[in-house]
């Protein structure tokens, strides 16, 4: 079982390989000096049907370096960054993992593109492995709450409350959504 020639790349090069390309072979892409690689640089020859070989993902692309490009902080509810830090310049990558009891959908890594957007795929999503969700928490008088998403919230996520200036928070500042679908505490209050 073998793979066909790896997909070509404009303004870049492909690592050395010999033919036939055996299943398990890795080829690596890189870009010429003034270009930046967007996408996974390594492709793996795999077989899905034990008959034909195929490459496990599309080839990355080489974008002409844009020194003015910068991308916003990427947020994945239920996830956290394991690689990458601000500022995010053209060609920089960020890799995510999901919190405990969350599973990932999509590709774990994204790249800062010349158009100031993350790509070449969408940001991954972290989905709760528990079907239960906690109901949306109410806003509080003279205060606010921040949550990683809106509406009902998956177990493992939390909501942080704060009070407007001149008010004191009474109760729990951070409330966690438990795997039971219940909140770890009642909302606090803001008192003068």
């Amino acid at each position: 079982i073998s793979c066909g020639s790896p997909p070509p790349i404009l303004n870049g090069r492909i690592s050395y390989y010999s033919t036939p390309i055996a299943v398990g072979t890795v080829i690596r892409y890189s870009c010429s000096g003034t270009f930046r690689l967007i996408g996974e640089k390594s492709l793996l020859c795999i077989t899905k049907d034990k008959v034909d070989g195929t490459w496990d993902k599309p080839a990355p692309k080489c974008e002409y370096f844009n020194k003015y490009s910068s991308c916003p902080e990427p947020i994945v509810p239920g996830g956290y960054k394991i690689r990458g830090s601000t500022p995010y310049r053209h060609g920089d990558s960020v890799t995510f993992a999901c919190k405990t009891n969350f599973s990932m959908n999509g590709n774990k890594s994204v790249w800062c593109q010349a158009n100031n957007m993350w790509g070449p795929t969408r940001l991954p999503t972290c989905v709760s492995v528990f079907p239960l969700e906690c109901p949306a928490l109410p806003m509080i008088h003279n205060g606010h709450h921040t949550s990683e998403n809106v509406g009902s919230i998956a177990p493992g996520l939390s909501v942080t409350y704060s009070c407007e200036s001149g008010y004191l928070l009474v109760g729990e500042k951070i409330i966690n959504c438990l795997s039971s679908g219940k909140w770890s505490a009642v909302p606090p209050t803001c008192e003068e």
Epitope: S15, Y16, S30, S42
Partner: antibody, heavy 119, light 106 residues
Framework: QVQLVQSGAEVKKPGSSVKVSCKAS????????ISWVRQAPGQGLEWMGR????????NYAQKFQGRVTITADKSTSTAYMELSSLRSEDTAVYYC????????????WGQGTLVTVSS | EIVMTQSPATLSVSPGERATLSCRAG??????LAWYQQKPGQAPRLLIY???TRATGIPARFSGSGSGTEFTLTISSLQSEDFAVYYC????????FGQGTKLEIK
Amino acid sequence: QVQLVQSGAEVKKPGSSVKVSCKASGGTFSTYAISWVRQAPGQGLEWMGRIIPILGIANYAQKFQGRVTITADKSTSTAYMELSSLRSEDTAVYYCAREDDISGYYQDWGQGTLVTVSS
Amino acid sequence: EIVMTQSPATLSVSPGERATLSCRAGQSINSHLAWYQQKPGQAPRLLIYDASTRATGIPARFSGSGSGTEFTLTISSLQSEDFAVYYCQQYEYWYTFGQGTKLEIK
């Protein structure tokens, strides 16, 4: 950080086989590649082959083709390397080493297993 | 297979001084090169990957450079714990290691 713990030292007779295990803890076993690298006494490092557990695909260095078999058990997060038709030149420390995805370089190594081939 | 050649076989340097280790590939390997440190009785430890990127937790005194066929590992100011054997490894086409350079105290 992923921890790789290998089985203990072995003494074998020429012509026999040896099977060394490498148990991984931390990280997702099936998403990375495990290579086997050996080091004869006072010598350098020699790549033998590698397996990608999620795919069950193993590839071998030309030198060891037909004599080495690398397998993985995803349920126990353990990789195995079996070397057959042992000869005295196979006396070495055998290491398992982990690549994150298919990066090509090894972030984590087992502690090594000494295999001595002697009559 | 791609042959990796390291030089010198042994390098004697005094603590606090700079050490420069070389690695040559038998054909172009782009930047697909890693450096490892190995101390007696221990497994190798990743220092550098992609020719010049320091691995997590590796001190800034270690730096890598080069691309194509010529690569260098530089240790800017040698500490006592840096005396060890250093290996380069290519991952352009499968995997091969250099024969190692022993860095010893002068």
